[in-house]
């Protein structure tokens, strides 16, 4: 059970500092269905800086390195939550926001009803 | 520039409505990279229900439906923000966490130091 | 509130050309992909084509056959449909929109559309 307003301490405890083996993903490169990864940044936002992913095709990459247009790159969302400045500009108040993030790009079989 | 400790309502807003179109996602079963989505249930986190996807295969699935072994199904990772009762059990206290959650699969070509 | 604004249409002769813009408000343009669709007299809305966001990635329907080209201007929000050799049966009323899941993206999804711009080829 959550009351309404709560007291929120910012100092974030990173839980996954012992990530094993630690290393920066190179996936949105090397996936059949790549993607490009966008700054989103909101100074109203904590935290104010989102990166947002944007697929590169609107196939997939074959083994030859072609794209193909049988298959589908699809961008794999996400709600997340978001702490917004609520009244806007304040330093010290806030309220929950859910958001929806594209964090990847992965390649799905067509559904029947293709816009194509 | 934030405080250490702040208010928070945690009344949510959800920007997504407006989302169009909106959709109930089933690329989980129709990518070349699958996963299974496993319910993490922790009360002394908010929110206290998160999903996290595990790769069904090691390989990605090829035209013939068959999994494919020259490919690698790997997890797309995302940091998110979540609060934690601070300390335990506590009711309108909480401290800012950070965690690491796979929130799908995509299929990747594998990089030349590859295990096997 | 999202808006789209479609414009450029007309009445044109067979073998003409037009050029249709949309402009899109009250949304992160660079999505994903955008596209144009339309619906003929007395059909269902139809897929016409789209683009990626980095506007290198194209598709089309099979009924265009090199005569149409999309492309799109980040800067001024906006998405262009270049349709030559017009031929009877591309009299529609056009439309265009956001993509977010790109070419999955299925018509029956969305909620709201622009006002679309009618396109009639005749002689």
């Known amino acids: 059970n959550f009351p309404r307003t709560v007291m929120v301490n910012l100092n974030i405890h990173n839980r996954n500092t012992n990530t094993n083996p630690k290393r920066s993903s190179d996936y949105y490169d090397r996936s059949t269905s790549p993607w490009n990864l966008h700054r989103n940044e909101d100074p109203e936002r904590y935290p104010s800086v989102i990166w947002e992913a944007k697929c590169r095709h609107l196939g997939c990459i074959n083994a030859d390195g072609n794209v193909d247009y049988h298959m589908n790159s699809v961008p794999i969302q996400q709600e997340i939550l978001v702490l917004r400045r609520e009244p806007p500009h304040s330093p010290n108040s806030f309220r929950l926001e859910k958001i929806l993030v594209s964090v990847g790009c992965t390649c799905v079989t067509p559904i029947v009803h293709h816009v194509a | 520039n934030f405080p250490r400790t702040v208010m928070v309502n945690l009344n949510i807003h959800n920007r997504n409505t407006n989302t169009n179109p909106k959709r109930s996602s089933d690329y989980y079963d129709r990518s070349t990279s699958p996963w299974n989505l496993h319910r993490n249930e922790d009360p002394e986190r908010y929110p206290s229900v998160i999903w996290e996807a595990k790769c069904r295969h090691l390989g990605c699935i090829n035209a013939d439906g068959n999994v494919d072994y020259h490919m690698n199904s790997v997890p797309i990772q995302q940091e998110i923000l979540v609060l934690r009762r601070e300390p335990p059990h506590s009711p309108n206290s909480f401290r800012l966490e950070k965690i690491l959650v796979s929130v799908g699969c995509t299929c990747v070509t594998p990089i030349v130091h590859h295990v096997a | 509130q999202v808006q789209l604004v479609e414009s450029g249409g007309g009445l044109v002769q067979p073998g003409g050309s037009l050029r249709l813009s949309c402009a899109v408000s009250?949304?992160?343009?660079?999505?994903?992909?955008m596209g144009w669709f339309r619906r003929p007299p007395g059909k269902e809305r139809e897929f016409v084509a789209a683009i990626s966001w980095s506007g290198g990635d194209t598709k089309y329907a099979d009924f265009v056959t090199d005569r149409f080209t999309i492309s799109r201007d980040d800067a001024k929000s906006t998405v262009y449909l270049q349709m030559n050799s017009l031929k009877p049966e591309d009299t529609a009323v056009y439309y265009c929109?956001?993509?977010?899941?790109?070419?999955?993206?299925?018509?029956?999804?969305?909620?709201?559309w622009g006002q679309g711009t009618q396109v009639t080829v005749s002689s």
């Open positions: 929109n956001d993509m977010p899941y790109g070419l999955d993206t299925r018509m029956d999804e969305y909620e709201y």
């Open positions: 009250g949304r992160t343009f660079s999505s994903y992909a």
